[in-house]
Amino acid sequence: PSPPPEKKELRKVAHLTGKSNSRSMPLEWEDTYGIVLLSGVKYKKGGLVINETGLYFVYSKVYFRGQSCNNLPLSHKVYMRNSKYPQDLVMMEGKMMSYCTTGQMWARSSYLGAVFNLTSADHLYVNVSELSLVNFEESQTFFGLYKL
Amino acid sequence: PSPPPEKKELRKVAHLTGKSNSRSMPLEWEDTYGIVLLSGVKYKKGGLVINETGLYFVYSKVYFRGQSCNNLPLSHKVYMRNSKYPQDLVMMEGKMMSYCTTGQMWARSSYLGAVFNLTSADHLYVNVSELSLVNFEESQTFFGLYKL
Amino acid sequence: PSPPPEKKELRKVAHLTGKSNSRSMPLEWEDTYGIVLLSGVKYKKGGLVINETGLYFVYSKVYFRGQSCNNLPLSHKVYMRNSKYPQDLVMMEGKMMSYCTTGQMWARSSYLGAVFNLTSADHLYVNVSELSLVNFEESQTFFGLYKL
């Protein structure tokens, strides 16, 4: 007899977009409306919660902009938290200093993306240094991953 | 009897590189020569045409440069068009303002990459704000995707 | 009888992080400690060595910074070398010119990522123009790939 039909496993994937009511760190994300994806991964209080150990490609983009450039240092981090470890682990980080002309209207993006071995119950978050300078348009600021 | 050998499906993938005869938007791409890939996806008038619904990682990089900086706002968009929808959907976007010193020779890149749920017959394109400031070297300006 | 259990093939993947004892080009990488991954790919003298022909997503980020900006042109390249070809092939490249205010402390990242058809025995490397301006923190400067 032929083997039973293969059970097509749902791809573990997330693509979350900017949410302008973020008031503190970590950033919060839109997980329901628009071009959002969330399958086989949970979203909880700003974090993507891994429920299956394995290799994941993780990415994030943040769009910073301002009206009167003061060159405040900008940072953009993707970090991981797990109850088994006391401290957050910074997985990827981008920093910018001296990036615009004083007083000018300015805009700049930071993009991060790489492969990590993640464990069930890992929580992934995004942090920025200057929340007031982030623009949360869904096409400009986002956070995602997929299991390889 | 043993089951028939598995039919290895061709990976749906594209990597197109800059084409300097782009005269208008959307950008046009080299789809034949050099480090180009095009498999299971069609290329038509600047666009990648999806022929199988599913999850795709989509990416693009654009290299902007100029002889004498005047800080024209730069934008780099990946957008989607489908005959079922009246309006283009901007999937990812990068913007830059106040990024160089007035009068200086300058160079800067914009990188975008994320996961999207695409539908058969979706057309994906890249748009930039200042075509004359784009350098089309194959290693510097490109557009690609692959099905997860 | 039921077919033999499928042999789960190890995913070919690498994520290497910055190594501050790089003294010349190509950059050298940490391949053992920290958030490093190396599976089904070899690391040799700064290079990732492909041992199975196929499609790979290749990425790299480099974090440049300095104490006193003098706007030295920065370049960041991922290139490929194979004994069958006389010359290195630049796969991806980012360049920056006129990116900070003269005399100021500055920081900037370059990110590259795309899909390539790689052949067994291809060696992949990362090159930068100004080694002294690279910061090698593991979260900031990295090089990786995975087989699709």
Epitope: G66, Q67, S68, C69, N70, N71, L72, S98, T102, G103, Q104, M105, S132, L133 | P73, K95 | T101, Q104
Partner: antibody, heavy 119, light 111 residues
């Protein structure tokens, strides 16, 4: 509460220089650029330039280039505007104003400093 | 640089009535969906006070009788029902690019 307090009135001779100070309090000083605007007697407002309180560099109105210098002392949360080679038409009230990078306009202003240039 | 032109130079209105002040820019002050136009009020011997930012947004603490409108090159400040404390000079200013420039001002006086 947010305050920008400027130094007192000055009388200068033509050809001299004047240095006006502007001290910020009640907010995180290095989060805001400081702009300088002047107003000649009975006239409108004229933008002179802006300084980064974080980085210390400035952008000036071309009209004043070479005559104006803006500096910052982060330790005292004070910005200085020095105008050299004074002429009678520089007689004006000089204002400092802060500008939040994330906003659209100068939201708080100093009380103004009258500089009189007269022989 | 962008030149701002206000009209009229002087406007005489009775208390309780509506006042409409106009400002024109020599080129568009819009970018990316926003209009970089601000309005300030100045009384004799005082520093300017921000009323409206980004063409139509009321600054915190400013009475709702003040409103702004317009986009591109043409902007309007409207005071719906003039109070005695509203008689002052009003300036428009763009913040689209450096150098910022102000209009020459409109003096609002009691009729």
């Amino acid at each position: 509460q947010v305050q920008l307090v400027q130094s007192g009135a000055e009388v200068k001779k033509p050809g001299a220089s004047v240095k006006v100070s502007c001290k910020g309090s009640g907010y995180t000083f290095t989060d805001y650029t400081i702009h300088w605007v002047r107003q000649a007697p009975g006239q409108g407002l004229e933008w002179m330039g802006v300084i980064s309180t974080y980085q210390g560099d400035a952008s000036y109105n071309q009209k004043f280039k070479g005559r104006v210098t803006m500096t910052v002392d982060k330790s005292t949360s004070t910005v200085y505007m020095e105008l050299s080679s004074l002429r009678s038409e520089d007689t004006a009230v000089y204002y400092c104003a802060r500008f939040p990078d994330w906003d659209y306009a100068m939201d708080y202003w100093g009380q103004g400093t009258l500089v009189t240039v007269s022989s | 640089e962008i030149v701002m032109t206000q009209s009229p130079a002087t406007l005489s209105v009775s208390p309780g009535e509506r006042a409409t002040l106009s400002c024109k820019a020599s080129q568009s002050v819009d970018y990316d969906g926003d209009s970089y136009m601000n309005w300030y009020q100045q009384k004799p011997g005082q520093a300017p006070r921000l009323l409206i930012y980004a063409a139509s947004n009321l600054e915190s603490g400013i009475p709702a009788r003040f409103s702004g409108s317009g986009s591109g090159t043409e902007f309007t400040l409207t005071i719906s029902s003039l109070q005695s404390e509203d008689f002052a000079v009003y300036y428009c200013q763009h913040s689209r690019e450096l150098p910022y420039t102000f209009g020459q001002g409109t003096k609002l006086e009691i009729k």
